[in-house]
């Protein structure tokens, strides 16, 4: 799974617009039932907030055990806390449940920092605030643990809704989400909106607060405004995308395209940050400092290190810009932009000055295994992954954080030629890709 | 070298403004590596932190002094100055001007102070 | 609002006598910690910053140590020069408005 700003904390060429508009989500067949529409019953579902993740209740095993589960789509096991852990209120107790199976097989997954390593089982799970059904999924039953588990997030698994082929301890650890398609009638499609607060929150707060939802087998149409947009999934591993071009306050960063997706560009709501390969986090963070000159910051706030403080509902947003990125659209030589604000980058902390503050984090950090666009992006924007048709789509987030100047965007298309060369072709070797 | 030094009267009525100015010698208070501040400390007592400026005129107060606190730029004069309004006697304290170097972080050169009286 | 307790309040060496400091975090503050001197009637001068740097033109014999909540300055060997009053301040949260209370190092 990826790496530094790691949930677990592991916190192109473009052109004018097209005058014409081409096939988006109008052009949608809801060939699949409820594919579609409302689905009351999964909206807020998910609570925590960007730092520490979004959760899910699931059930697992017979008589159910309820845990929550941090919604994660940079990784492809479904793994819980199955021994006592000080971080952990409560655990999977597989002695306890009538249905557990034991695979008679061991897992150890490793980050750059931490790891968690556990026995593999199946059981029944089920998804209380989802879809009405029951699977019998793969788990991961963790007995040890080093910097994976968060004092505080309320969170006590792990849901890797990614593709198989990164699952450990190998691909033919089949991931909960194709379990849960081949077993029952719901769409191979789901969508997440990850509401960020756009302040702190104090631990009574998080536990009380709404975090967003994910829409299981659908779409919902009360989570968006304006149109759906999709770009191809590259490759079904992790959510791999394409990203064209990147503007700071309509600047182009003016890079070779393929510098963006160095080594690959993926969608992650278990990553906290906006997380860059280090030419264009340089080269963003210079244009960032540019546009905000009219004050400076300590080094360390851009590292991502320091927090800069105001004084409460002072922070001025209007002096940081605007970031735009050109995602492959899903007809030739068409792209589209997705556009954050600061209020979505600026990562608000909680509990380190006094209340009369406002203090923040620079949420877009350095990455030496490629762009991950983390919960700051994804914050912004209602996303779909349509696993069926092989595409993620956005659309401006109905609970985004914004204010009366500016407004988070998906804007296109834009006419965008030699997209395919924007790709990074990783060199195949024996080794794990996770082990950056 | 540069150096920094305070200057203002050392006697203040209470309910009046406190006024002091810091000039920069040896070198431009334009530079764009670093922010200016003041620092008091009253009478055997610890450092208090009370604001700083950035040579575009940007600037940073205490919460806790924020509505009495003007801090303020002349580049012309290679001078920044304080301003502290409807002061009581537990103003009373030896200002400090200082600079905030590496990184914008650490207050890495100070003037020597100049202690200020508040009192009728 | 992160609170810096200095400890002790008072140290009472002899010249010569390694000196410890303590400073401790009421959170986190990351290695975003400086270590000030100030003898009477002058203004503090910068001994450390980033908890283990030593600021231009500092003697060797002071180092800082520690990360997260718990610091440390050292004086490995006190001359009589360095018998004062010495602050810590935390600049993880930015401004950099909070310091500690203060140690004195007296002559015993």
């Known amino acids: 799974t990826q790496h530094g700003i790691r949930l677990p904390l592991r916190s192109g060429l473009g052109g004018a617009p097209l005058g014409l508009r081409l096939p988006r989500e109008t052009d949608e067949e809801p060939e699949e039932p409820g594919r579609r529409g409302s689905f009351v019953e999964m909206v807020d579902n998910l609570r925590g907030k960007s730092g520490q993740g979004y959760y899910v209740e699931m059930t697992v095993g017979s008589p159910p055990q309820t845990l929550n589960i941090l919604v994660d789509t940079g990784s492809s096991n479904f793994a819980v806390g199955a021994a006592p852990h000080p971080f952990l209120h409560r655990y999977y107790q597989r002695q306890l449940s009538s249905t557990y199976r034991d695979l008679r097989k061991g897992v150890y997954v490793p980050y750059t920092q931490g790891k968690w390593e556990g026995e593999l089982g199946t059981d029944l799970v089920s998804i209380p605030h989802g879809p009405n059904v029951t699977v019998r999924a793969n788990i991961a039953a963790i007995t040890e643990s080093d910097k994976f588990f968060i004092n505080g997030s309320n969170w006590e698994g792990i849901l890797g809704l990614a593709y198989a082929e990164i699952a450990r301890p190998d691909d033919s650890l089949e991931p909960f989400f194709d379990s849960l398609v081949k077993q029952t009638h719901v769409p191979n499609l789901f969508s997440l909106q990850l509401c960020g607060a756009g302040f702190p929150l104090n631990q009574s707060e998080v536990l009380a607060s709404v975090g967003g939802s994910m829409i299981i087998g659908g779409i919902d149409h009360s989570l968006y405004t304006g149109s759906l947009w999709y770009t191809p999934i590259r490759r079904e591993w992790y959510y791999e995308v394409i990203i064209v071009r990147v503007e700071i306050n309509g600047q182009d960063l003016k890079m070779d395209c393929k510098e963006y997706n160095y080594d690959k560009s993926i969608v992650d709501s278990g990553t906290t940050n906006l997380r860059l390969p280090k030419k264009v986090f340089e080269a963003a963070v210079k244009s960032i400092k540019a546009a905000s000159s009219t004050e400076k910051f300590p080094d360390g706030f851009w590292l991502g290190e320091q927090l800069v403080c105001w004084q409460a509902g002072t922070t001025p947003w209007n002096i940081f810009p605007v970031i735009s990125l050109y995602l492959m659209g899903e007809v030739t030589n068409q792209s589209f932009r997705i556009t954050i604000l600061p209020q979505q980058y600026l990562r608000p902390v909680e509990d380190v000055a006094t209340s009369q503050d406002d203090c923040y984090k620079f949420a877009i950090s350095q990455s030496s295994t490629g762009t991950v666009m983390g919960a700051v992006i994804m914050e912004g924007f209602y996303v779909v992954f349509d696993r069926a048709r092989k595409r993620i789509g956005f659309a401006v987030s109905a609970c985004h954080v914004h204010d009366e100047f500016r407004t988070a965007a998906v804007e296109g298309p834009f006419v965008t030629l030699d997209m395919e060369d924007c790709g990074y072709n990783i060199p195949q070797t024996d080794e794990s890709t996770l082990m950056t | 070298q540069l150096q920094l030094q305070e200057s203002g009267p050392g006697l203040v009525k209470p309910s009046e403004t406190l006024s002091l100015t810091c000039t920069v010698s040896?070198?431009?208070?334009?530079?764009?590596?670093?922010?200016w501040g003041w620092i008091r400390q009253p009478p055997g007592k610890g450092l208090e932190w009370i604001g700083q400026i950035y040579y575009s005129g940007s600037t940073f107060y205490n919460p806790s002094l924020k509505s009495r606190v003007t801090i303020s730029v002349d580049t012309s004069k290679n001078q920044f100055s304080l301003k502290l309004s409807s002061v009581t006697a537990a103003d009373t304290a030896v200002y400090y001007c200082?600079?905030?170097?590496?990184?914008?972080?650490?207050?890495?050169?100070w003037g020597r102070g100049t202690l200020v009286t508040v009192s009728s | 609002e992160i609170v810096l307790t200095q400890s002790p309040a008072t140290l009472s060496l002899s010249p010569g006598e390694r000196a410890t400091l303590s400073c401790r975090a009421s959170?986190?503050?990351?290695?975003?910690l400086a270590w000030f001197q100030q003898k009477p009637g002058q203004a503090p001068r910068l001994l450390i910053y980033d908890a283990s740097n030593r600021a231009t033109g500092i003697p060797a014999r002071f180092s800082g140590s520690g990360s997260g909540t718990d610091f440390t300055l050292t004086i490995s060997s006190l001359e009589p020069e360095d018998f004062a009053v010495y602050y810590c301040q935390q600049v993880y949260v930015w401004p950099p408005r909070t310091f500690g209370g203060g140690t004195k190092v007296e002559i015993k």
């Open positions: 200082a600079r905030l170097g590496h990184g914008y972080s650490y207050f890495d050169l």
């Open positions: 959170q986190s503050v990351s290695s975003y």
């Open positions: 040896g070198g431009s208070i334009s530079s764009s590596s670093y922010y």
